[in-house]
Structure formats: structure tokens, C-alpha cells
């Protein structure tokens, strides 16, 4: 649960429930980035402002979740309360620019993703593995993944017992880990970037 | 607002067994993991284990496999503790928290208290 | 097990004082430490999880930060409802462990 998603929550748990009937409403029409799908309305409008985060940020990831968000309490003449969520969104980032992330254009965008591409700097390079791991979990990680990675004693053999799961992963699980590195370890991403 | 209301104060006997619970509210159950906290009388905090109501899955603090059985019932959003073979240093207060994820604990029970006397 | 070790075990101070309070890691743990707030008769309360960063719903005037294996809490302008317990737990290796404790008291 990171800062955007805080930041999400904050939002919606102060919105009346008109407001958030409205919001879902909205969410229903509002155009997405390509590459990602739309939250089910039978699921949707049942939901409350802690599972309506859930679900946001499961669907779009933290960094694009936020945006949508702010992109809809806008349309709703919600232009401070919009404000305030990407001002804490973006607050505090070391990633460049302000963390934002792009889009799992999986069928859009060829070759490997950049973890893939980077598996073996990152194997060598990243320190702090459990940031990770608590990132991950419960989004692509399950109870037996996560305490397989720390039950491994060294920074190397726990990204490697990482990445062995990562052959099952998607675009869009792959793109958590980034999240997560570019949370954690904003420098080394760069510096892979570049490379 | 999440919620976390444990079951009231218990008092057993050396070698019985106590079993208390945790009512979760105001958010998905399954959503997050269930951690548990011992807390003696004038001492430290000592983690117990955790449950992810998902699944089952438990994962315990070593120091405690052999005293606490933790479970949890999707339907009643309850996660439960039972202590067994109780003897007086297991006299403390017993918190249930929330986990973010299994590594911090974002919402605390109000506790319960076990008191192990002959 | 990882050892924190928290002082000092007991700080007085006037409301208004800016206070921090200590948690030193036995070994290297990264960012993974998280603070707690526990004041009598209530249950604890998350106030900075990895090492800094803030908890919505928690003041501003709560801040962490780490260096190295020392890592510490800082109140800016203690108020009368901050008077209570602090303590810290580490997530880098099973068991998760705890400070012993703080205490914030009015002097």
C-alpha cells in the first residue's frame, strides 16, 4: 500500500455517498489509456471507497489509478480535491518525472519488458529485496512466493528466486515490480534507463 | 472505519487452553493479513504469526508453533487465536492487527487479556 | 533475531518541545522499520511505515528517518495528545521484532 494509494483512499473516504455514486458512474465512461481494461459494473457500484481503492489500484496500478481518479473528481467539479491527490501522489518522488510510470501496452509495445531486459543488473544491483516483496504481495506474489524469496540468504539469490516466478507474470505484473523498483531504488532504474 | 473488536478477558488454568477472537469491519476480510501480538505485563511486544484469511495461509513466529493455532472464518470476517498448554508467562495481552501486508501492521484490536492462574 | 533497541526508555517534555526518539537495528535491515504510536487505554497506532514515509490520517508533525542502522521519529512541536508509548518493529527477517519502547511523558 503506497503513497498513492493513501492518497486514492483519502479521496473517496471523503466524498459523500452521492458523491461516490457519481464517481463510479463516472468511472464507467470515462476513456482510458490503451492497454488497460475496464472495472466490471456489476462489481463496481457495489463496492465501498476502501474496496473501490482495491480495485483502482489493482486494475491500474498505483501511478495511473491516481490519475484516473483526479482525472474523474475533476469531471465532477472536484477541481481541489483532484489537486490534493496528485500534489500527495507526487509528493516525496525520487523518481523522474514525479514517478510516472507508462501504460502495459503489452500488445502495443514489442520486445522485452525492462525488467526482463535488466534481469541480470538487477539480480546484482538491488539492495532492498523485501520493499519488494511487500509491494508485490498479494498482487503477484502469493504466502508460499514471498516466504520462498526472503526464506533465500542474499540480496542476488533472492531476486533470483524473484525472477523464477516471473515467467508467469504479464506486462502488467511486470510493471509492479518497476513501480516498486522505481519506488524503492529510483537511481538504479535510472542508471538501467540510460544504459 | 476499519474496525478490530476482540473477545473478552480470559482466565484458565495451568495446561488448559484458551481460544479468543477478532471481528474485522469496514473492510474486505480477505483482503489483508491478520497478525498477532503478545504483549506481557512490563515487557516488550513479541510477534506471534500471521494468517492470510485468503487462504489459510499461516506463517508463525518459531517461538510460538507450538502454542498458537491461528485460523480464520471468511463468513463471519472473524480471525480467531488458540493458545494451548497455557502456563503463567503466557499471561499477557494478546492484539490482533491488520496487515498492510505481512510485513506492518496498519490497525490494532483493542486486545485481549489471558491470565494463566492456578 | 534482530535486536532494536530503542532509547531513551523515557523522555520528558513540554508541550511545544521538538522531540526525536531513537531505534538503533542490531544488523543492516534497509528501510524496513516501522513506527507505532501507544497511548493508554487504546490500541496502537501505525504512524510511519518504512522508515519515512507517512501514514494518511497520521499529523505532519511526524516524520522518520533512517541512516544506516539508527533510525529515528521526530515530533515537531509535541502536542498533549501525543504523550504515550513509541515504539519501533523491523520487517527485514522473520521474526518480526520490537523496540522496547519509549515513553513520551509530560514533565
Known amino acids: 500500500m503506497g503513497r498513492a494509494r493513501d492518497a486514492i483512499l483519502d479521496a473517496l473516504e471523503n466524498l459523500t455517498a452521492e458523491e461516490l455514486k457519481k464517481f463510479k458512474l463516472k468511472l464507467l465512461s470515462v476513456p482510458l489509456r490503451e492497454g488497460y481494461g475496464r472495472i466490471p459494473r456489476g462489481a463496481l457500484l457495489s463496492m465501498d471507497a476502501l474496496d473501490l481503492t482495491d480495485k483502482l489500484v489493482s486494475f491500474y496500478l498505483e501511478t495511473y489509478g491516481a490519475e484516473l481518479t483526479a482525472n474523474v473528481l475533476r469531471d465532477m467539479g472536484l477541481q481541489e480535491m483532484a489537486g490534493q491527490l496528485q500534489a500527495a501522489t507526487h509528493q516525496g518522488s525520487g523518481a523522474a518525472p514525479a514517478g510516472i510510470q507508462a501504460p502495459p501496452q503489452s500488445a502495443a509495445k514489442p520486445g522485452l519488458h525492462f525488467i526482463d531486459q535488466h534481469r541480470a543488473a538487477l539480480i546484482a544491483r538491488v539492495t532492498n529485496v523485501e520493499w519488494l516483496l511487500d509491494a508485490l504481495y498479494g498482487k503477484v506474489l502469493t504466502d508460499e512466493q514471498y516466504q520462498a524469496v526472503r526464506a533465500e540468504p542474499t540480496n542476488p539469490s533472492k531476486m533470483r528466486k524473484l525472477f523464477s516466478f516471473t515467467p508467469a507474470w504479464n506486462w502488467t505484473c511486470k510493471d509492479l515490480l518497476l513501480q516498486a523498483l522505481r519506488e524503492s531504488q529510483s537511481y538504479l532504474v535510472e542508471d538501467l534507463e540510460r544504459s | 472505519q476499519v474496525q478490530l473488536q476482540q473477545s473478552g478477558a480470559e482466565l484458565a488454568r495451568p495446561g488448559a487452553s484458551v481460544k479468543m477472537s477478532c471481528k474485522a469491519s469496514?473492510?474486505?476480510?480477505?483482503?489483508?493479513?491478520m497478525h498477532w501480538v503478545k504483549q506481557r505485563p512490563g515487557q516488550g511486544l513479541e510477534w506471534i504469526g500471521y494468517?492470510?484469511?485468503?487462504?489459510?495461509?499461516?506463517y508463525y513466529n518459531q517461538n510460538f508453533k507450538d502454542k498458537a493455532t491461528l485460523t480464520a472464518d471468511k463468513s463471519s470476517s472473524t480471525a480467531y487465536m488458540q493458545l494451548s498448554n497455557l502456563a503463567s508467562d503466557d499471561s499477557a495481552v494478546y492484539y490482533c492487527?491488520?496487515?498492510?501486508?505481512?510485513?506492518?501492521?496498519?490497525?490494532w484490536g483493542q486486545g485481549t487479556l489471558v491470565t494463566v492462574s492456578a | 533475531d534482530i535486536v532494536l533497541t530503542q532509547s531513551p526508555a523515557t523522555l520528558s517534555v513540554t508541550p511545544g518541545d521538538s522531540v526525536s526518539l531513537s531505534c538503533r537495528a542490531s544488523q543492516s535491515i534497509g528501510n524496513n522499520l516501522h513506527w507505532y504510536q501507544h497511548k493508554s487505554h487504546e490500541s496502537p497506532r501505525l504512524l510511519i511505515k518504512?522508515?519515512?514515509q507517512s501514514i494518511s490520517g497520521i499529523p505532519s508533525r511526524f516524520s522518520g528517518s533512517e541512516s544506516g542502522t539508527d533510525f529515528t521519529l521526530s515530533i515537531n512541536s509535541v502536542e498533549t495528545e501525543d504523550f504515550g508509548i513509541y515504539f519501533c518493529?523491523?520487517?527485514?527477517?522473520?521474526?518480526?521484532?520490537f523496540g522496547g519502547g519509549t515513553k513520551l511523558e509530560i514533565k
Open positions: 469496514g473492510y474486505t476480510f480477505t483482503t489483508y493479513t
Open positions: 518504512y522508515a519515512s
Open positions: 518493529q523491523q520487517s527485514k527477517s522473520w521474526p518480526w521484532t
Open positions: 492487527a491488520l496487515g498492510g501486508n505481512p510485513a506492518w501492521f496498519a490497525y
Open positions: 494468517i492470510n484469511p485468503s487462504s489459510g495461509y499461516t
